[in-house]
Structure formats: structure tokens, C-alpha cells
């Protein structure tokens, strides 16, 4: 139930995250299954763990197996595995479907190819990106960020891209790449009227004076590309920009999350060092397409303050 | 507001089943592990059973393999499936919240609880 | 199991006088986060459970300032400085370092 499937190629970088939900206070302990042996946490250790993630730095393929992570939270513990394999490099150019990363679909309007499991690695831009193991080079390709960017998709554009970094630790380099194919469809989507997920409408969040909070807005508007979605914040009716609070910002998240097959957008409000007079806020998040505008409220309450009586 | 509402007790003979509902309002609900506790007549709070954000369940040994946890995030909603039932399972039945993990601050415990539910197994 | 008690099982308290109910678990409620998982409540008649304090010693939202927890490891205290009317109930500790685990808990009612 709460396995997960990582791969990568000997002499590479493999960085995994533990399949179980943890929180940065909660340790995580991780051990290779077959022997239940403990992996340690030094960083001199070719093969260590590191909170949620366990790094092979580089990896090897007798490092293939199973491993198991146990978050340490407070009433339960929380297992998951790790169903890891490491292959040997191909001498050719063709990747194995067995390294291939989930295939992502395209079209002319949308046609951004992610980079898989970046995220988890310190790298630094520019990534690097191969079709069929060819450079990419020409104005119509442009690496941005985590992702590739196709102007005016043609079917010709479909086939296996390839992404190259370097992931750094403590002043060491390893390569890492990861393949995944890029088909391209006519757009058959369709729209309809917003759907917030979350925040849940009149949500209270409970925050504390001089912390941090984050507020998501996140919403779904149908299915395909939309021609017009959006997502934002507003503070006592006004627009984020116009309200002129430095503190409060917006950032747009993933810009468009296809889950089940539908498109949906995330916006989350950053608020840094929290005011008492934040409480007093209204926070509206907005999502509005061609149907029409959704919005939901959100009202700050302050968390209790941590009074220590000894 | 954050509220839990509890529903479906009853009365109901030895060996027989009945489905506790819990609905949630007023946050986010598939961020918080959610848990059910009773309390017999007169007597304690008793911890019965737990389902995490992920959809992992816990139970208690009075009830491991007789009662079902499960909760549907789309409905906001908690579960609780009891089979089997003994007259020692009668009780109030309190649907309850925890930890927050879109929290990384303090976990509050079992911070918010609904009115109860009266569930009486006799002949 | 993690096994809580309490002291004592009932307190028959003046209204304006302090109080103070004793808890004991079998093994420290520390965890590897530094934190301990050791909370209060009040149960007043025909009401479920209120949460009073969470970590030993920190007040929920709304809970007067006359309740304050104490405590380390394995012993724990609850302590109302001026015991009011409206404090009449059942006081249960709870442990969620593993599972969960309720004292028996201490009735208190008013002289």
C-alpha cells in the first residue's frame, strides 16, 4: 500500500523520499528490508539517509532492494518501502521502457515536459535536454526552470526527452537523468463552473503572532487546456498587488496539475512574520474561468500562545 | 465554525452491525488524521480506532478485526463499521480530530470533538 | 501500552481555592521531536471532552489562565489556581506518544 517504485542507473545520483507523509521534527529511520539493517545517517557513507530521503551518492547496482522508512510521529509510527533498482548503464542510445518516467501528453496551446523527480536533488539551472539522445538546440526549445518548453507543438515533436543535471552535496558532483515520453493530442477538453478544493468555505486557520503562515487556494476548472483559469487571493475584496501589505505575497504553484485527468491551478499566500492585525483580514480565495467566479472565505484566529507554566 | 456531528446509533442485538458517520465542517478535512473514542456509561474515555491522512487504520485490541475505520475526504466524512457487536461495546461514541499534517507546528492533541452518538447493544 | 493514572479520583474543592490533580504514566511521553505528548481535559456533565492544555504545560485557545500543566517524563500536574463554578467535571490526562491512553480521570465538584 505504501510502496514506491524508484530506479536509476549506476554512477548516478538516486535520491528516493520515503512514501509515508512526515513533518521536518519527526525523525524518519530508515533500513535496507532484507537484513533489517539500519542505514546510517553520515554523509560520508556512499549510501545514507537523510531525513524523508535516502541518498545513493552515486548509486550502485548492488544497491537494488528494498527499503523500509519508519516516520517516528507522535501516536503512530508511519511505515512505508522503497522498492528500489539500479541499472547498469546502456551502451546505446535507446532507453528501456524499465527507466521511463510516466509518459506526459501535450498540444499546440500546452506543452511543458517536467523534468521527473528534480525536485528532490540541489541542482542549478540550466537543465539539460536530450530527444531520442540528441541535444536539443534551436529557438523553438526552451529550458525553463524544471521544465522544457515546446513553442508551436508539431506531432514530429513526440517521442523520448531526456533531462540532465548535476546534483551538488557538501561540494560533490553527480549526474543524474531521468527519460520520459512526450506524446502529442488534439485538445478535447472541456470547462466547467470553478470547483475549490481547498481552502473548505469559512475555514478557520489557526496561526501564531510572529510565525509564518501559508494559505493554498487551490481549484479545478474541467478537463484539458482552459482557455481562461485562474486562481488568486484577495485581502478585504482587494487584489494581493493593490492591497500593499510587503508581508503578503501570492505564488503561483504547479500552473496546471492534471489529476484525474483534470486541470486544476494553486496559488498560495505567503504571509510572513504574522500580525495581530492580520487576524482581522478577510481572506477570499478566488477562482474564476468563462463560467463564472467561486469564491471561499478564510479567517485567521490566532493559535494559543505557548504559555509555560513550571 | 468547526464542527463534528455524529450519526447512525442505535440500539442493535449482540452480534449484530451498525455504521457510525461523522461529518465534517469548518477545515480542511483530508489534512488531519481523525479518530474515534467512547466513553460507557459512568466510565472512561476509551481510545477505539484511527485513520491517518494517508488512509492507514488503528485499532484498538478490544475491537482489531470486528470494527472498520475509513473516511472519504470528498464527503468530508468519518466511518466507523462495527461488527459483531458486544454488550461491552455500548457506549457513547465521540468522532474526533488530530494531528494536522499541513501543520508543521504543534500538534494539538484530539483538539475538537462532536456531541457523541449512543450505541446500545442488548437483547 | 502506555498505562496513565491519576490522583486523586475525586476533589471536593471551595469555590476561590486552588486545586490540583496528579498524573502518572508507566513510561516518559518524551519524543525523539523533543516534545511531550501529554494533554488535558475537561469533561463537564452531559458535554464530551474539552481540550484544556496540549505538551504539558501550553493552554488551548479560550481556556482561562487559572488552568496551567506542569510536569516531565512521567509525572504531570494540572493546577487551577481559583476553582470557579463552571470547573465542575471529569479531568482526564491523555497520552498520544503512543496511541492514545486516558487516565481514569478526577470528578471535581464544588463545596
Known amino acids: 500500500k505504501f510502496s514506491k517504485q524508484s530506479w536509476g542507473l549506476e554512477n548516478e545520483a538516486l535520491i528516493v523520499r520515503c512514501p509515508r507523509q512526515g513533518k521536518p521534527s519527526y525523525t524518519v529511520d530508515w533500513y535496507y528490508s532484507q537484513t533489517n539493517k539500519s542505514i546510517p545517517t553520515q554523509e560520508r557513507n556512499r549510501v545514507f539517509a537523510s531525513g524523508q530521503l535516502l541518498k545513493f551518492l552515486p548509486a550502485a547496482v548492488a544497491d537494488s532492494g528494498i527499503y523500509t522508512c519508519i516516520v517516528r510521529s507522535p501516536t503512530f509510527n508511519r511505515t512505508g518501502y522503497a522498492n528500489v533498482t539500479i541499472y547498469k548503464k546502456q551502451s546505446d542510445c535507446n532507453v528501456p521502457d524499465y527507466l521511463m518516467y510516466s509518459t506526459v501528453s501535450g498540444s499546440e496551446k500546452n506543452s511543458k515536459i517536467y523534468c521527473p523527480t528534480i525536485d528532490l536533488y540541489n541542482w542549478t539551472a540550466p537543465l539539460e535536454w536530450f530527444k531520442n539522445c540528441q541535444a536539443l538546440q534551436g529557438s523553438r526549445y526552451r529550458a525553463h526552470k524544471s521544465f522544457l518548453v515546446i513553442d508551436n507543438v508539431m506531432t514530429e515533436d513526440a517521442g523520448d526527452y531526456t533531462c540532465k543535471f548535476i546534483h551538488n552535496e557538501n561540494g560533490a558532483n553527480y549526474s543524474v537523468t531521468a527519460t520520459r515520453s512526450f506524446t502529442v493530442k488534439d485538445e478535447q477538453g472541456f470547462s466547467l463552473f470553478p470547483v475549490i478544493g481547498a481552502p473548505a468555505q469559512n475555514e478557520i486557520k489557526e496561526v501564531e503572532i510572529g510565525k509564518n503562515a501559508n494559505l493554498t487556494c487551490s481549484a479545478c476548472f474541467g478537463k484539458g487546456t482552459q482557455f481562461l483559469a485562474a486562481v488568486l487571493w484577495q485581502l478585504n475584496g482587494t487584489k494581493i498587488t493593490d492591497f500593499g501589505e510587503p508581508r503578503i505575497q501570492q505564488e503561483e504553484g504547479q500552473n496546471q496539475s492534471f489529476s484525474n485527468g483534470l486541470a486544476c491551478l494553486d496559488m498560495v499566500l505567503r504571509i510572513a512574520d504574522v500580525k495581530e492585525e492580520d487576524l482581522l483580514l478577510q481572506y477570499d480565495c478566488l477562482a474564476l474561468n468563462l463560467h463564472g467566479l467561486r469564491r471561499h472565505t478564510v479567517r485567521l484566529s490566532r493559535k494559543n500562545p505557548i504559555d509555560h507554566h513550571s | 465554525e468547526v464542527q463534528l456531528v455524529e450519526s447512525g446509533g442505535g440500539l442493535v442485538q449482540p452480534g449484530g452491525s451498525l455504521r457510525l458517520s461523522c461529518a465534517a465542517s469548518?477545515?480542511?478535512?483530508?489534512?488531519?488524521?481523525m479518530h474515534w473514542v467512547r466513553q460507557a456509561t459512568g466510565k472512561g474515555l476509551e481510545w477505539v480506532s484511527s485513520?491517518?491522512?494517508?488512509?492507514?487504520?488503528y485499532y484498538s485490541g478490544s475491537v482489531k478485526g470486528r470494527f472498520t475505520i475509513s473516511r472519504e475526504n470528498a464527503r468530508n466524512s468519518l466511518y466507523l463499521q462495527m461488527n459483531s457487536l458486544r454488550a461491552g461495546d455500548t457506549a457513547v461514541y465521540y468522532c474526533t480530530r488530530g494531528e494536522d499534517w499541513s501543520d508543521d507546528d504543534y500538534y494539538y492533541g484530539l483538539d475538537v470533538w462532536g456531541q457523541g452518538t449512543t450505541v446500545t447493544v442488548s437483547s | 501500552n502506555i498505562v496513565m493514572t491519576q490522583t486523586p479520583l475525586s476533589l471536593s474543592v471551595t469555590p476561590g481555592q486552588p486545586a490540583s490533580i496528579s498524573c502518572k504514566s508507566s513510561q516518559s511521553l518524551l519524543h525523539s521531536d523533543g516534545k511531550t505528548y501529554l494533554f488535558w481535559y475537561l469533561q463537564k456533565p452531559g458535554q464530551p471532552p474539552q481540550l484544556l492544555i496540549y505538551g504539558v504545560s501550553n493552554r488551548f485557545s479560550g481556556v482561562p489562565d487559572r488552568f496551567s500543566g506542569s510536569g516531565s517524563g512521567t509525572d504531570f500536574t494540572l493546577k487551577i489556581s481559583r476553582v470557579e463554578a463552571e470547573d465542575v467535571g471529569v479531568y482526564y490526562c491523555m497520552q498520544s506518544l503512543q496511541l492514545f491512553t486516558f487516565g481514569p480521570g478526577t470528578k471535581v465538584e464544588i463545596k
Open positions: 485513520i491517518d491522512t494517508e488512509g492507514d487504520t
Open positions: 469548518g477545515f480542511t478535512f483530508s489534512t488531519f488524521d
